[in-house]
Interface confidence: medium
């Protein structure tokens, strides 16, 4: 196993309706064509998978079909977008990146995006 | 607490469609995932389709892809499910389900014991 540098922002705020985006970005090495990302949610000294998805490089990102993130993949780039966040999902979210293959195999872990999440008020009558 | 009625079942030939529809009354949260479970008789209930109704991509399982549809309108509070080229296997009576999601991310959004809020169901019936 052989470290690979990986780069995210380091505060985002999610929006008002709950969806946080953010880029993670990884150091080649060499000519990987098929990558998996993982996205980690730290807090309370607990790591919690959030999501992950497997692509080859120049394809479209595929996470689950019921998984909360979507994404999108540029080169060395993966655009993530996490939906579906309340106050109490706070934390810490942290892109680990494989390239799977070929040979030999390296794994980059970054140091973690801190995702800021406000509720809104609900507002009777107009909106969920 | 969160009240869901869903409507727009009925019997319709294999080829046709349907539209389900799914409001939302006395709601806490200004958003929630919200999905469309289906069971049939002697059939364990499944996940059909799911959005966050603040945005982003919806779900689909893979006997919805291509032919279902899910929708949002958050003025009215109602969700939709658009479902076109039914088959005989669509047979199920058609639930809907929503959770305002904090914190419980990992079970996804179309596991059955995600949701805290359901209807009351809709009778769905293809004919060969």
């Known amino acids: 196993c052989k470290a690979m540098h990986v780069a995210q922002p380091a505060v985002v705020l999610a929006s008002s309706r709950g969806i946080a985006s953010f880029v993670c970005e990884y150091a080649s090495p060499g000519k990987a064509t098929e990558v998996r990302v993982t996205v980690l949610r730290q807090a309370d000294s607990q790591v919690t998978e959030v999501c992950a998805a497997t692509y080859m490089m120049g394809n479209e990102l595929t996470f689950l079909d019921d998984s909360i993130c979507t994404g999108t993949s540029s080169g060395n780039q993966v655009n993530l977008t996490i939906q579906g966040l309340r106050a109490m999902d706070t934390g810490l979210y942290i892109c680990k990146v494989e390239l799977m293959y070929p040979p030999p195999y390296y794994l980059g872990i970054g140091n973690g995006t801190q995702i800021y999440v406000i509720d809104p008020e609900p507002c009777p009558d107009s909106d969920f | 607490q969160v009240q869901l009625q869903e409507s727009g079942g009925g019997s319709v030939q294999a080829g046709g469609s349907l539209r389900l529809s799914c409001t939302v009354s006395?709601?806490?949260?200004?958003?929630?995932?919200m999905a469309w479970f289906r069971q049939a008789p002697g059939k364990e209930r499944e996940g059909v389709a799911s959005?966050?109704?603040?945005?982003?991509?919806?779900g689909y399982a893979d006997s919805a892809k291509g032919r279902f549809t899910i929708s949002t309108d958050n003025a009215k509070n109602t969700i939709y499910l658009q479902m076109n080229s039914l088959k005989p296997e669509d047979t199920a009576m058609y639930y809907c389900?929503?959770?305002?999601?904090?914190?419980?991310?990992?079970?996804?959004?179309?596991?059955?014991?995600?949701?805290?809020?359901w209807g009351q169901g809709t009778q769905v019936t293809v004919s060969s």
């Open positions: 389900a929503a959770d305002d999601r904090g914190g419980r991310w990992s079970l996804g959004t179309m596991a059955v014991g995600g949701y805290k809020y």
């Open positions: 006395q709601h806490t949260s200004r958003y929630y995932y």
């Open positions: 959005i966050w109704t603040g945005g982003g991509t919806p």
